[in-house]
């Protein structure tokens, strides 16, 4: 019994004056609480509690279920307790079969004993299966058996409390341990698409997937820089024991331009938080932006190949693409493909392959593209570089020698005189007249140059060379002179093409 200091309130005293009392099933339990300020008796076992306002607690025929802690409390809130075991060979355990354990914490298998004198109070696996090697426990006849530091691997473990009675092992009813996992990492969050592009009035719907070990993970959709609560719908699944998935779907049924912005899916647990964002861009109407990938002014040599290449952004998807030259549409030699296979791709590539270009194929090549909202076009001006071609070389009636050459870039015509029979003409002759003529062909065709010299300046036999050249190459034509006495014979022109 507690010792009492004079003047201080003291706890009640209980008769019989023991901490533990063992009675047989069917016998009487009589407990007396002595205290001038007696208030009540309380009985506790497992989740059950009973009260009694009489200072004497009497149970005429004790049952195993009367096993438990009896506490007497006075008006000062001071109390004293006695633990009563009601020994019943037919019911060695009192059992609360609910068994939950938090990972890494201790949990109590609640199977208190009705007889403290049995031996080997412990846990056993069901159907003779061994317990996990690392499972440690501490038995307490009044409370049950404490499993230390519960592991995730113990989830769904089936076990019994066990004692030895008269040399035989007796098992309690079975317990199934349900382990509540501890959060050892932040939730895993992902979003159905990283960016969305919509026209006004279209529905915006985005799904965030949250994965964690249990359903107690918290998640929400937030709009960056806004406190507005967003409307979201949830679906969730348990894929096995510690694999929980939630899908949080955010919907704006008719998106407006001012709904554009960054939306964040946020999730947290006791370990930490994670988030993922998606960007919404709402445009009032669709668009097409074309970007040339080569210079829009193209110079290419006669007979060579060149690709006219554009990249373009189109939203919504492009519906019609075409390449046009001289009002004719190309049916082949071109291709159009998405820049990436990404579902949210809006960038495309179009290529027109011009092969073995001829001098006559210079001009404006136009790429046109349209979608349901807009049309767009881009033009390439293609110039085909060609070696000069001497179109005419004549002696005119006024005694002039005339040379007309065509090519691109514009040819330069030089004149040379070779006296006698020499093949190499080095003495240059200044032209009397040089003109660039308007070509009858397309504006991107060859440029025509006409140059004339006065043949009366030549007093000796020889050859006059008209040489037309540009960056691509050169071509020559020759006029032969022959004098008989003072008369100049008919001039014979001939050409020699020089690569």
């Amino acid at each position: 019994q507690p010792s009492v200091s004079p003047g201080e309130p003291s706890p009640p005293s209980i008769h019989p004056g023991k901490s533990d009392l063992i009675v047989r099933v069917g016998d009487e339990i009589r407990l007396l609480c002595t205290d001038p300020g007696f208030v009540k008796w309380t009985f506790e076992i497992l989740d059950e509690t009973n009260e009694n306002k009489q200072n004497e607690w009497i149970t005429e025929k004790a049952e195993a279920t009367n096993t438990g802690k009896y506490t007497c409390t006075n008006k000062h809130g001071l109390s004293n307790s006695i633990y009563v075991f009601v020994r019943d060979p037919a019911k060695l355990f009192l059992v609360d079969r609910s068994l939950y354990g938090k990972e890494d914490n201790d949990t109590l298998v609640r199977c208190p004993l009705t007889d403290p004198e049995v031996t080997n109070y412990s846990l056993k696996g069901c159907q003779g299966k061994p317990l996990p090697k690392d499972l440690r426990f501490i038995p307490d006849p009044k409370a049950g058996i404490m499993i230390k530091s519960v592991k995730r691997a113990y989830h769904r473990l089936c076990l019994h409390c066990s004692v030895d009675q008269e040399g035989k092992s007796v098992l309690s009813e079975k317990f199934i341990l349900k382990v509540r996992p501890a959060f050892k990492a932040v939730p895993v969050v992902s979003v159905s698409k990283a960016s969305y592009l919509l026209r006004e009035g279209e529905e915006f719907t985005v799904t965030c997937t949250i994965k964690d070990v249990s359903s107690s993970v918290y998640s929400t959709w937030k709009r960056e820089n806004s406190q507005t609560k967003l409307q979201e719908k949830y679906n969730s699944w348990h894929h096995g024991d510690f694999n929980y998935e939630r899908q949080a779907t955010l919907t704006i049924s008719s998106a407006r331009v001012n709904d554009s912005g960054v939306f964040m899916c946020y999730a947290n647990n006791t370990f930490g938080s994670a988030n993922v964002t998606t960007t919404l861009e709402v445009v009032d109407k669709g668009f097409i932006n074309i970007f040339p990938m080569i210079n829009t002014t193209v110079f290419v040599n006669d007979g060579e190949n060149v690709d006219l290449i554009v990249e373009y952004e189109a939203f919504p998807k492009p519906e019609h693409q075409q390449w046009i030259y001289m009002n004719r549409t190309f049916t082949d030699k071109w291709e159009d493909y998405p820049k990436s296979e990404n579902e949210s791709n809006i960038r495309y590539v179009s290529e027109l392959h011009l092969t073995r270009l001829k001098g006559t194929e210079g001009g404006t090549y136009t790429f046109l593209v349209s979608n349901s909202d807009v049309n767009a076009a881009i033009a390439f001006n293609v110039y085909v570089n060609t070696k000069p071609e001497i179109l005419t070389y004549d002696r005119l009636v006024n005694g002039m020698l005339q040379c007309v050459a065509a090519g691109f870039p514009e040819p330069t015509i030089d004149w040379y005189f070779c006296p006698g029979t020499e093949q190499r003409c080095s003495a240059s002759v200044l032209p009397v007249d040089v003109q660039t003529l308007n070509s009858s062909g397309p504006p991107f065709g060859k440029l025509v140059v006409q140059s004339s010299i006065d043949s009366s300046a030549f007093k000796h036999n020889g050859t006059v060379e008209c040489k037309a050249y540009n960056d691509v190459g050169k071509t020559s034509a020759y006029f032969n002179f022959a004098f008989k006495g003072n008369n100049k014979e008919q001039i014979h022109p001939h050409t020699l093409f020089t690569p």
Epitope: M293, I294, F299, V300, D307, E335, D336, T355
Partner: antibody, heavy 117, light 112 residues
Framework: EVQLQQSGPELVKTGTSVKISCKAS????????MHWVKQSHGKSLEWIGY????????TYNQKFRGKATFTVDTSSSTTYMQFNSLTSEDSAVYFC??????????WGQGTSVTVSS | EVVVTQTPLSLPVSFGDQVSISCRSS???????????LSWYLHKPGQSPQLLIY???NRFSGVPDRFSGSGSGTEFTLEISTIKPEDLGMYYC?????????FGGGTKLEIK
């Protein structure tokens, strides 16, 4: 005459990076894409990607994304390829090549890169 | 990615022989516009590869007419009508329709 002149051989250390060049002449540089191709010793050719010589836009083979970086200097008609975080697997001959009509019509002479530890 | 398989790996020849090299792709090389970007290259030791044929059958400028290309869809062939010494080397086909572009494994043309 179209010519693609590449920089000389490189001997580099593991973990470093290398930048090789390809100087074009004989044609309108900005009218074409430049592609880069890898040939490991005794192996076939492998396409790395390409760059627009007009505006520097790039496309990479997924396998080389993050490993190769293309740049262009239009004033000198030169394209560059930088290879990062080099390992022995990157030891190879690298070619630049001009592309038209879905084919590579002119090639550089190749640049040998040897990665040593 | 499109896998391009070239056969044979090695082709021993005598000068004057006619030979063909096959190139097979794991999917059709014809795009939705009807274009097929299949080209052939000759790579001689110490030199850069040179384009022979583009667009299945178009000879590149300066390529002798003893070289010809044919095929469609997934099966393509390079033919050399009369082998000359300068034709020896490694031959590669390239598909330029689907990214990433892929080369065949190569065929070594060597003297018997």
């Amino acid at each position: 005459e179209v010519q693609l002149q590449q920089s000389g051989p490189e001997l580099v250390k593991t973990g470093t990076s290398v930048k090789i060049s390809c100087k074009a002449s004989g044609y309108s540089f900005s009218n074409y894409y430049m592609h880069w191709v890898k040939q490991s010793h005794g192996k076939s050719l492998e396409w790395i990607g390409y760059i627009s010589c007009f505006n520097g836009a790039t496309t990479y083979n997924q396998k080389f994304r993050g490993k190769a970086t293309f740049t262009v200097d239009t004033s000198s008609s030169t394209t560059y390829m930088q290879f990062n975080s080099l390992t022995s697997e990157d030891s190879a001959v690298y070619f630049c090549a001009r592309r038209t009509a879905g084919a590579m019509d002119y090639w550089g002479q190749g640049t040998s890169v040897t990665v040593s530890s | 990615e499109v896998v391009v398989t070239q056969t044979p790996l090695s082709l021993p020849v005598s000068f004057g022989d006619q030979v063909s090299i096959s190139c097979r792709s794991s999917q059709s090389l014809a795009n939705s516009y009807g274009n097929t970007y299949l080209s052939w290259y000759l790579h001689k030791p110490g030199q850069s590869p040179q384009l022979l044929i583009y667009g299945i059958s178009n000879r590149f400028s300066g390529v002798p007419d003893r070289f010809s290309g044919s095929g469609s869809g997934t099966e393509f062939t390079l033919e050399i009508s009369t082998i000359k010494p300068e034709d020896l080397g490694m031959y590669y086909c390239l598909q330029g329709t689907h990214q990433p572009y892929t080369f065949g494994g190569g065929t070594k043309l060597e003297i018997k």
